[in-house]
């Protein structure tokens, strides 16, 4: 069974610490209004005026899971943290698809970096997404900016379009996932 | 749901090898590693290496390198342990372990006991 | 490579007791760091994943504490099915590696 939400936010403006996107009748709209192309999701029915959405309120649905992009600052452990809060995970990157409407939505934010669930104990061990999965290459390249002085940057964000790893420690903005069963 | 189920107990005699199975269901097969982990008999577990099912790639532990091959057969879903020149010290339960969140063991198989005596 | 050890190697208690369980590592490991169960003839059976967090379906009985080289499981009050061996592990560097268990046996 899927578990639908109600809500009739119209909202695209920070509040709670998350950025919000406008419910429309058929569709999520992306959170910026330089984002044309919306996103149509999988099950979204409108009754009496409200959306309903198998995502909490102010989520961004794509496809079979739900987005939320937190606007609150913390390191990639404290990000984790806040998404199981949630009843999710930090962002799991499974399909070219779904890494592009990611990157549509970051690159409105040119400023922000967001923490995705992929991270490792040191530059020995591969890279691990956040259930234990294992990370391919395939989908993307990850963007080193280890130095002489910050040798271990052992946790993953995305920038605009670029994936890069970095000191697990910084705080930074983060993206989380909440799969759901139709 | 997850399963992981392993091939029967093994008699060895030294100096020979035994390859162990382990047929994973209820999941995508080659998203996680598997480990591989055996135990003597009153003992404590010891790590031995894995595999990552999709790519084939291994990392043995130190101890095992040279008589150790981990394989896979993605098209039914089996991840394969040999241990070769055994002596009397491999007896041991030998258990495979599908890799979960921070690189911990969130499911195992039932054990394969694999007895070494001339 | 990384030594784990743990204290006491064995521990008799009763049913309701709080008990507390310590693995160190030879070294940092941060928070990556697993606590098991293991009962006689069974397979282990997965408690803490992250030094910290607990695996779904484990009792909230159960808990993990702990970064960098020292770490502590805790079962609030135990049950009689909480009699058992119980191992850290850490996976923070090749080869992971296991400590040598915690005996848990009725008192």
């Known amino acids: 069974t899927m578990a639908i939400w109600r809500s009739n936010s119209g909202s695209n403006t920070l509040e709670n610490g998350y950025f919000l996107s406008r419910n429309k009748e058929n569709h999520s709209q992306p959170t910026q209004s330089s984002l044309e192309d919306s996103v149509t999701p999988t099950k979204a029915v409108k009754t009496t005026g409200v959306l309903s959405s198998p995502c909490p309120p102010n989520w961004i649905i794509y496809e079979k899971s739900c987005y939320l992009f937190s606007m609150s600052l913390n390191s990639w452990d404290g990000s984790k943290r806040q998404c199981w809060q949630l009843g999710s995970n930090l962002l799991k990157i499974d399909s070219s698809n779904e890494l592009g409407f990611i990157v549509k939505q970051v690159s409105s934010q040119p400023d922000n970096s967001f923490w995705i669930g992929l991270s490792r104990p040191q530059t020995e061990v591969p890279w691990l997404w956040e259930d234990g999965s294992t990370f391919s290459s395939n989908l993307f390249q990850i963007r080193t900016t280890a130095t002489q002085e910050n040798p271990s940057p052992n946790c993953v964000w995305i920038h605009v379009s670029v994936i890069y790893d970095q000191l697990c420690s910084v705080p930074s903005y983060s993206i989380c996932e909440k799969k759901f069963s139709m | 749901q997850v399963q992981l189920v392993q091939s029967g107990a093994e008699v060895k005699k030294p100096g020979a090898s035994v390859k162990v199975s382990c047929k994973s269901s209820?999941?995508?097969?080659?998203?996680?590693?598997i480990h591989w982990v055996r135990q003597a008999p009153g003992q404590g577990l010891e790590w031995m290496g894995w595999?990552?099912?999709?790519?084939?790639?291994?990392n043995y532990a130190q101890k095992f390198q040279g008589r150790i091959t981990m394989t896979r057969d993605t098209s039914i879903s089996t991840a394969y342990l040999e241990l070769s020149r055994l002596r009397s010290d491999d007896t041991a339960v030998f258990y495979c372990?599908?890799?979960?969140?921070?690189?911990?063991?969130?499911?195992w198989g039932q054990g394969t006991l694999v007895t070494v005596s001339s | 490579d990384i030594q784990m050890t743990q204290s006491p190697s064995s521990v008799s208690a009763s049913v309701g007791d709080r008990v507390t369980i310590t693995c160190r590592a030879s070294?940092?490991?941060?928070?990556?760091l697993a606590w098991y169960q293991q009962k006689p003839g069974k397979a282990p059976k997965l408690l803490i994943f992250?030094?910290?967090s607990l695996q779904s379906g484990v009792p909230s009985r159960f808990s993990g504490s702990g970064s960098g080289t020292d770490f502590t499981l805790t079962v609030s009050s135990l049950q009689p099915e909480d009699f058992a061996t119980y191992y850290c592990?850490?996976?923070?560097?090749?080869?992971?590696?296991f400590g040598p268990g915690t005996k848990v046996d009725i008192e």
């Open positions: 595999i990552n099912p999709n790519s084939g790639d291994t």
């Open positions: 209820g999941y995508t097969f080659t998203d996680y590693y």
């Open positions: 992250g030094a910290s």
């Open positions: 070294q940092g490991i941060s928070s990556w």
């Open positions: 372990a599908r890799n979960s969140g921070s690189y911990s063991f969130g499911y």
């Open positions: 592990q850490q996976a923070y560097s090749f080869p992971f590696a």
